[in-house]
Interface confidence: low
């Protein structure tokens, strides 16, 4: 069966939107009005992985682009990147682990934990227009909570 996907945008707990900042970078900033059209639309695919009631494995691709968020080691540190893939082969049900995030729902907020690097989360900075990154702390200065908006 084909992999089930939905289109959505994400905002962090400070209501910052995610936009492209270079071919392989995302940044988070506050957008209003027409500028909201700049925000990235994700194609969230429901993939194979450990699943529970509040933890669902997903892959986060960019809608209409063959780019996926992935987690790799760079200089011995878990790092978030946008990785290009062959559009003929993605998305697929059994995604490589670096593409998989555990979508965790807590109090109507979402966290995205790397399946490759447990306890590392998609994160944003408090500061405006800074890169989206993989962070190893929850509940600290950096933001790991998101809300999801469905896009038709």
């Amino acid at each position: 069966a084909p992999v089930r996907s939905l289109h959505c945008t994400l905002r962090d707990a400070q209501l910052k939107s995610l936009v492209m900042s270079g071919p392989y970078e995302l940044k988070a900033l506050h957008l209003q009005g027409q500028d909201l059209e700049q925000q990235v639309v994700f194609s969230m695919s429901f993939v194979q992985g450990e699943e529970s009631n509040d933890k669902i494995p997903v892959a986060l691709g960019l809608k209409a682009k063959n780019l996926y968020l992935s987690c790799v080691l760079k200089d011995d540190k878990p790092t978030l990147q946008l990785e290009s893939v062959d559009p003929k082969n993605y998305p697929k049900k059994k995604m490589e682990k670096r593409f998989v995030f555990n979508k965790i729902e807590i109090n109507n907020k979402l966290e995205f934990e790397s399946a490759q690097f447990p306890n590392w989360y998609i994160s944003t900075s408090q500061a405006e227009s800074m890169p989206v990154f993989l962070g190893g702390t929850r509940g600290g200065q950096d933001i790991t909570d998101f809300t999801m908006q469905f896009v038709s």
């Epitope: 492209m20 900042s21 071919p23 700049q38 062959d86 559009p87």
Partner: antibody
Framework: EVQLVQSGAEVKKPGESLKISCKGS????????IGWVRQMPGKGLEWMGI????????RYSPSFQGQVTISADKSISTAYLQWSSLKASDTAMYYC???????????WGQGTMVTVSS | EIVLTQSPATLSLSPGERATLSCRAS??????LAWYQQKPGQAPRLLIY???NRATGIPARFSGSGSGTDFTLTISSLEPEDFAVYYC?????????FGQGTKLEIK
């Protein structure tokens, strides 16, 4: 049809300024990076810089940083390459090209020949 | 800064023969490598992206392989229109350099 159409050939004198253009059509111009590539007579391809028209985020090759300026006007789907003071060594063919998400320049303009001579 | 070195500089072959062009990176570029063909008086044309994927409309006689630092463009059986200059190109962070080119000429 997806295409990039560049402005015509230019003949200039050393010290003059110049701005050449690259107009995109047939696709969402703001969704793709546009790169500029130089080819000096009888030589190979040299990447100069790249711009994302949506927000004009621009990155330059160190070899061209400070030598040229890359800009874009998304309202008319056009990217630009400009010089404030041309040198004879700027004589070359200049191509614009669309940069895809799979790490390649897939659509190329026809090229603009710039000749700088006194 | 990553440097791409293509070899040979010139390759002389006859139609129907197999052509093998090499591109070596000074450090690993994963699979972020593309190949282009350029004929005299024309703009370059994308042949291969991500090391091994043929671009739209490119004949099956063109194939790419390799990863890391060593990449190969193979033309299985040369047609008269294949004689041209071939360039490899890669991305590393915000650098997009090209190799110096291989001229494929008729023997």
């Amino acid at each position: 049809e997806v295409q990039l159409v560049q402005s015509g050939a230019e003949v200039k004198k050393p010290g003059e300024s110049l701005k050449i253009s690259c107009k995109g059509s047939g696709y969402s111009f703001t969704s793709y990076w546009i790169g500029w590539v130089r080819q000096m007579p009888g030589k190979g391809l040299e990447w100069m810089g790249i711009i994302y028209p949506s927000d004009s985020d621009t990155r330059y090759s160190p070899s061209f940083q400070g030598q040229v300026t890359i800009s874009a006007d998304k309202s008319i789907s056009t990217a630009y390459l400009q010089w404030s003071s041309l040198k004879a060594s700027d004589t070359a063919m200049y191509y614009c090209a669309r940069y895809t998400n799979w790490d390649a320049f897939d659509i190329w303009g026809q090229g603009t020949m710039v000749t700088v001579s006194s | 800064e990553i440097v791409l070195t293509q070899s040979p500089a010139t390759l002389s072959l006859s139609p129907g023969e197999r052509a093998t062009l090499s591109c070596r990176a000074s450090q690993s570029v994963s699979s972020y490598l593309a190949w282009y063909q350029q004929k005299p008086g024309q703009a370059p044309r994308l042949l291969i992206y991500d090391a091994s994927n043929r671009a739209t409309g490119i004949p099956a006689r063109f194939s790419g392989s390799g990863s890391g630092t060593d990449f190969t463009l193979t033309i299985s059986s040369l047609e008269p229109e294949d004689f041209a200059v071939y360039y490899c190109q890669q991305r590393s962070n915000w650098m997009f350099p090209f190799g110096q080119g291989t001229k494929l000429e008729i023997k």
